[in-house]
Amino acid sequence: MAVTACQGLGFVVSLIGIAGIIAATCMDQWSTQDLYNNPVTAVFNYQGLWRSCVRESSGFTECRGYFTLLGLPAMLQAVRALMIVGIVLGAIGLLVSIFALKCIRIGSMEDSAKANMTLTSGIMFIVSGLCAIAGVSVFANMLVTNFWMSTANMYTGMGGMVQTVQTRYTFGAALFVGWVAGGLTLIGGVMMCIACRGLAPEETNYKAVSYHASGHSVAYKPGGFKASTGFGSNTKNKKIYDGGARTEDEVQSYPSKHDYV
């Protein structure tokens, strides 16, 4: 039950996280014009990974894509790459984790296979989250550097007569979305890895024990599976489903209402 909950919650958290990473990557507000301590302009600038936009006070917004690859800063390219890698890994992780979910039954898939898939998806989510956090952090660092550089030469002028106010950029909404989303994906991945441990069948080496009861013998073998008749002592808080004695967390049957998170 706890494993199912952990796995299900990990999946949901990762799903939200990856949706957030996609949203952040597509958003135009990675950097926004700094309005603090600046003259009030009738134009507001903001930039994303793919295009830059200008919103006029008239309400008109114009966005222009970065129609060059070679002309873009290497850091921006790196951020793009990190975010895309994060999305791709996250998407694959989601696909894998869907089949690994304990509450979903696919043929006669073994628990060990589900455990491996859960671990794989968990690792993918962790790497995806780290990619997103790294990408957003690199961009944020770039912004901070540029901010202080432009603050140093805030006003550039010709002989001090004419002043040109440099547009400074600060953190946009996409950065916060990216950080939160990356964190959620990371947490989801950790939860999947934790769930994997509970999903893996216990390889406890119990000695084979023979019980004699009025000429009718029931042998329990080390794997925990019932070997012969349909009755026997349900030791170690085991439940019997479909002729198989397994721990509550190992049961691979149609889920009861309690199996859903």
Epitope: Q33, P39, V40, T41, A42, V43, N45, Q47, S52, C53, V54, E56, S57, S58, G59, F60, E62, R64, V162, Q163, T164, V165, Q166, T167
Partner: antibody
């Protein structure tokens, strides 16, 4: 056809109040930023105030800040300018205008005269 | 506040001749985000409301004859009329549309010579 019609002007004593209205038609009023511009007799144009389309932002000239209030009613397609503590130097023709591309005032009303005199 | 300085104050022109009006701003009106200059030109004919001629320093408003052209960047701007016609007489204003308050120039009166 875009139309802006101002009303509410007239003679008022110094320290008095007046409310100007501007009825808009022929365009999407709720999606447009609107402005008031005035022109004192025989003088040049002076920007007074601007209100953004969503009603979120209002801007004022230093000369009217704290005395004038710009507002809008998108349901009625109307723009307003509430003028309090009026002074003789507020005497002017007040124009209502729509902001277009480049924040330029692309459509203007015919203007309404406000005279502040004792 | 941004100060907009227009020259000349008055410009006597013979119809058919070219005319040029200068406008200088105390701060650059160039927006780095889209590389556009937020400088607008208006014409106010006697007894009429102002009408928009040019925005973004060089983009003609629809319906404005192509004899009107705007140029300049940063702080120095120019409005040119290739051949002045009778309906072009009036007062021309430039306006800063970048910084609040959105200040106007003092105006240039284009009159018949």
């Amino acid at each position: 056809e875009v139309q802006l019609v101002e009303s509410g002007g007239g003679l008022v004593k110094p320290g008095g109040s007046l409310r100007l209205s501007c009825a808009a038609s022929g365009f999407s009023f709720s999606n447009s930023a609107m402005s008031w511009v005035r022109q004192a007799p025989g003088k040049g144009l002076e920007w007074v105030s601007t209100i953004s389309s969503g009603d979120s932002y209002t801007y004022y000239a230093d000369s009217v800040k704290g005395r004038f209030t710009i507002s809008r009613d998108n349901a009625k397609n109307s723009l307003y300018l509430q003028m309090n503590s009026l002074r003789a130097e507020d005497t002017a023709v007040y124009y209502c205008a729509r902001q277009g591309y480049g924040n330029a005032l692309d459509y203007w009303g015919q203007g309404t005269l406000v005279t502040v005199s004792s | 506040d941004i100060v907009m300085t227009q020259t000349p104050l008055s410009l006597p022109v013979t119809p058919g001749e070219p005319a040029s009006i200068s406008c200088k701003s105390s701060q650059s009106l160039l927006n780095s985000g889209n590389q556009k200059n937020y400088l607008t030109w208006y014409l106010q004919k006697p007894g009429q409301s102002p009408q928009l001629l040019i925005y973004w320093s060089s983009t003609r408003e629809s319906g404005v004859p192509d004899r009107f052209s705007g140029s300049g960047s940063g702080t120095d701007f120019t409005l040119k009329i290739s051949r002045v016609e009778a309906e072009d007489f009036g007062v021309y204003y430039c306006q800063n549309d970048y910084y609040y308050p959105l200040t106007f120039g003092g105006g240039t009166k284009v009159e018949i010579k």
